[in-house]
Amino acid sequence: PSGLVTANITDSEALARWQPAIATVDSYVISYTGEKVPEITRTVSGNTVEYALTDLEPATEYTLRIFAEKGPQKSSTITAKFTTDLDSPRDLTATEVQSETALLTWRPPRASVTGYLLVYESVDGTVKEVIVGPDTTSYSLADLSPSTHYTAKIQALNGPLRSNMIQTIFTTIGLLYPFPKDCSQAMLNGDTTSGLYTIYLNGDKAEALEVFCDMTSDGGGWIVFLRRKNGRENFYQNWKAYAAGFGDRREEFWLGLDNLNKITAQGQYELRVDLRDHGETAFAVYDKFSVGDAKTRYKLKVEGYSGTAGDSMAYHNGRSFSTFDKDTDSAITNCALSYKGAFWYRNCHRVNLMGRYGDNNHSQGVNWFHWKGHEHSIQFAEMKLRPSNFRNLEGRRKRA
């Protein structure tokens, strides 16, 4: 054989690959050994070209050898060397969490280490690093900020080798946002269950609004502003109804254009659309989303697509909202009237999530063109928004 290489190396596994011998052979004999590790020999079939090496020791240089056998004949041996990764410390935990202090504890890795790198980062992006000795398994954090979410990470060090980091998340005592202006702030207060919450527009306690928060999708913190799931709510509504909002926040509903305008005026928001149909799922995320005020007829801004559903909202970017009684689209016909819904229509739609539930007639139903086309009404759809910078805080809802 020739061209012996190793791939997919971890702290305990590696994959050996080789080019087969030119001649037909009965078997290959593989052996590998490392410092302070007894040699292991395995024989594999002559039509094998790779072999998974398992139960390896971390941070160890291994020598790998292979030769071919055909009857009593043996080929020359080829050799390769590789070093396993340093394994990570385990079970990083934050305990004794107070307003300004916390205790981090962990279990050491199997490999010997020369120290640990501890990194802890607060929600505002302040990062602190500390290196501790090889025999240390706990560290007291001090000078933390109250009511703050922290991510603590630890990495084992052994000379130039560094393990993967493991992390834990904890929140110091106190309420970060007494009057949360959106679901992300409610979440950062420690509320991690999806459901109904009161938010306060611009953090003003006089501007209370009941919303449904999705605290699970892609890190959570989303204000849901549209849900279609069963067809019980009538979405063929007039301008006034779409401005104010309608429906049951726990079921099918529309939060209201006035509310969307006020929320998105609070800062930079992103849009997420979740779609489900007969067990299939798709999503779209737009990292810039806003809705203008009534004077602009609630003009839509939606940019920066990523996801699996396809970029169907791009077609609607820059459009004003249309209902059957207020036609603002660029079509000669009234799109809302033609397609029995309401949306930021153009001429007319790639997206019709407020269309007729269950109607598979062309362009009439709950449509997302680049996922299911215009002749399939999608069973479940949600539109939701959260601050664009929330991605930096992803996962911080988890408790230490």
Partner: antibody
Framework: QVQLVESGGGLVQPGRSLRLSCAAS????????MHWVRQAPGKGLEWVSG????????YYADSVKGRFTISRDNAKNSLYLQMNSLRAEDTALYYC?????????????WGQGTMVTVSS | DIQMTQSPASLPTPVGDRVTITCRAS??????LNWYQQKPGKAPKLLIY???NLETGVPSRFSGSGSGTDFTLTISSLQPEDFATYYC?????????FGQGTKVDIK
């Protein structure tokens, strides 16, 4: 002003390859889908291939699928069409076209075209 | 693929006359229909998008209408510079397809 300039056309034998380029200027290149559209001598327009602004999604007409590859280099504001296994029926004037904002399949700016002749 | 059928193929017309070109899609395409003008030896030029929206800089004598499968391009009063070939194109789905063209020439 917004401009597209194609290059790379020429006479090539059947079965051989050719690479077309399109240099874009006057707009934020990576914000827009880009396309290649061709026109055989004396004939109508035929869409050949398209690519999203990021380059992450590519699309091809059935007539060229598996033979042509569209790509873009956003750092260089350039669009490319690698044409392999060329056939006589690929003889055409090849236009580079910019997709409209928000509806990338509407071609609002066109280059002047580069002629590809496939003949032995 | 969606087939686009234009008629007529040729349209000899005197200057000043009204011109109407029709385009039919083989399936429903809402308003995802564009019109292009091409003069001999030149690249095509977008005239109308979304069936009825005039592209910036295009004279107002050009207009478009229609929805679903049937569309029309109208030139209210033909000018000498309008003699060209006109193509419709659907941008509803990939592959984007063009009509075979309508040549408007001097009568």
């Amino acid at each position: 002003q917004v401009q597209l300039v194609e290059s790379g056309g020429g006479l090539v034998q059947p079965g051989r390859s050719l690479r077309l380029s399109c240099a874009a200027s006057g707009f934020t290149f990576d914000d827009y889908a880009m396309h290649w559209v061709r026109q055989a001598p004396g004939k109508g327009l035929e869409w050949v291939s398209g690519i999203s602004g990021s380059g992450g999604s590519t699309y091809y007409a059935d007539s060229v699928k598996g033979r042509f590859t569209i790509s873009r280099d956003n750092a260089k504001n350039s669009l490319y069409l690698q044409m392999n296994s060329l056939r006589a029926e690929d003889t055409a004037l090849y236009y580079c076209a910019k997709g409209q904002k928000g509806e990338g399949d509407t071609f609002d700016i066109w280059g002047q075209g580069t002629m590809v002749t496939v003949s032995s | 693929d969606i087939q686009m059928t234009q008629s007529p193929a040729s349209l000899p017309t005197p200057v000043g006359d009204r011109v109407t070109i029709t385009c039919r899609a083989s399936q429903y395409i809402q308003g995802f229909l564009n019109w292009y003008q091409q003069k001999p030896g030149k690249a095509p030029k977008l005239l109308i998008y979304d069936a009825s929206n005039l592209e910036t800089g295009v004279p107002s004598r050009f207009s478009g209408s229609g929805s679903g499968t049937d569309f029309t391009l109208t030139i209210s009063s033909l000018q000498p510079e309008d003699f060209a070939t006109y193509y419709c194109q659907q941008s509803y789905s990939t592959p984007q397809t063009f009509g075979q063209g309508t040549k408007v020439d001097i009568k």
